[in-house]
């Protein structure tokens, strides 16, 4: 089903994608699910949304916009936002919350790029991504304040109050409500 975009556009030149599959046209596949996904558009040189049918298709398909950009846009990761301290945050700090596929109930922390703070989340116990820390300190050290001194002080107290932990049990299957962006 997947067909490659023809490579006749000479002005693409230095804009060659990182992987050959980034040049493939968006392919929704034969199935009838409606899954919001992203693909790299060779002509606009941007990652764009499309609706995936749920089976087959091709490799130019990503669950998140971030994943698409990282995989197909040359130099994207090098332009990642730098922390105020001047030290660069690892790319995984910008990954969206991913509880994984399993049904466990692990209290973890992630860096929220919107609030610019480390926050608690429920992790299912397998898979997911590297924006996932066992302790608040570890998350802060790596993503909130890379290369800086340790946090501490009033900010920690306010944050601890802000993220009162709900002790309700885990959802029965994380994958029923897995994020689609």
């Amino acid at each position: 089903l997947s067909e490659e975009a023809d490579d006749t556009d000479s002005e693409l030149g230095s804009m060659k994608p990182l992987h050959t599959f980034c040049a493939m046209k968006a392919d929704d596949g034969p199935c009838k699910a409606m899954i919001r996904s992203y693909f790299f558009n060779m002509y606009t040189h941007q990652c764009e949304e499309f609706i995936y049918g749920g089976c087959e298709g091709n490799e130019n398909r990503f669950d998140t916009l971030e994943e698409c950009k990282k995989t197909c846009i040359p130099g994207y990761e090098k332009t990642a936002v730098k922390a105020a301290s001047g030290a660069e945050r690892p790319d995984f700090c910008f990954l969206e919350e991913d509880p994984g596929l399993c049904r466990g109930y692990m209290k973890r922390y992630l860096y929220n790029n919107q609030t610019k703070q480390c926050e608690r989340f429920v992790y299912g116990g397998c898979l997911g991504n590297r924006n996932n820390f066992e302790t608040l300190d570890e998350c802060k050290k790596i993503c909130e304040n890379p290369g800086g001194g340790s946090g501490g002080g009033l900010n920690d107290i306010f944050e601890a109050q802000k993220i009162e932990w709900h002790e309700g049990g885990p959802p029965h299957h994380h994958h029923h409500h897995h994020h689609h962006h």
Partner: antibody, heavy 120, light 113 residues
Framework: EVQLLESGGGLVQPGGSLRLSCAAS????????MSWVRQAPGKGLEWVSA????????YYADSVKGRFTISRDNSKNTLYLQMNSLRAEDTAVYYC?????????????WGQGTMVTVSS | QSVLTQPPSVSGAPGQRVTISCTGS?????????VHWYQQLPGTAPKLLIY???NRPSGVPDRFSGSKSGTSASLAITGLQAEDEADYYC????????????FGGGTKLTVLG
């Protein structure tokens, strides 16, 4: 009875492609995450890929990222593994497994496996 | 080289008790991930033996038990029987690999005749 039946294995040349299928029966297929695990001849087990029940989230081992694509068709109760740019080191028995059904995060039920041989 | 380390082989006489160790690190077993154990009889697919460190699926005899402490786990088999001769694998997940599944290299259990 819960059953998983893999098919699609065979002999393929390096650089070639193959699509494995795993037909599921005896349970509500769309409710469960599924995974592929492989075992090279005489070697141990290696996790390959996993997919959520809806098919909306997929995960891959670094060794196959960019080459393999996991997908599922819930209307056909079938799991797939599209394998491209195959290498000699991909030679293995490929098992499909239900992930976290009765357990929280184990590979609960396994198929009997299908053999993939990559050789010129 | 497997992420989780198991002894390549263990052996015991019928009726004896044997243990198989599975040693990990702070990014897998030590990070709070569950450990699971699988039994693979010769020429067959693996079968879940112990899940969530110490739980037995229905149908698995209580001669099999699992435990976890710190960065390691172990599988104990008591009252060894000839049909227990198989390969045994531990499995967990690893945060340094984005939570990917990781296995031990496997342990061949020989029941001495």
């Amino acid at each position: 009875e819960v059953q998983l039946l893999e098919s699609g294995g065979g002999l393929v040349q390096p650089g070639g492609s193959l699509r494995l299928s795993c037909a599921a029966s005896g349970f509500t297929f769309s409710s469960y995450a599924m995974s592929w695990v492989r075992q090279a001849p005489g070697k141990g087990l290696e996790w390959v890929s996993a997919i959520s029940g809806s098919g909306g989230s997929t995960y891959y081992a670094d060794s196959v990222k960019g080459r393999f694509t996991i997908s599922r068709d819930n209307s056909k109760n079938t799991l797939y593994l599209q394998m491209n740019s195959l290498r000699a080191e991909d030679t293995a028995v490929y098992y499909c497994a239900i992930l976290g059904a009765t357990s929280l995060s184990a590979f609960d039920i396994w198929g009997q496996g299908t053999m993939v041989t990559v050789s010129s | 080289q497997s992420v989780l380390t198991q002894p390549p082989s263990v052996s015991g006489a019928p009726g004896q008790r044997v243990t198989i160790s599975c040693t990990g690190s702070s990014s897998n077993i030590g990070a709070g991930y569950d450990v699971h154990w699988y039994q693979q009889l010769p020429g067959t697919a693996p079968k879940l033996l112990i899940y969530g460190n110490s739980n037995r699926p229905s149908g698995v005899p209580d001669r099999f038990s699992g435990s976890k402490s710190g960065t390691s786990a172990s599988l104990a088999i008591t009252g060894l029987q000839a049909e227990d001769e198989a390969d045994y694998y531990c499995q967990s997940y690893d945060s340094s690999l984005s939570g990917s599944g990781v296995f031990g290299g496997g342990t061949k259990l020989t029941v001495l005749g």
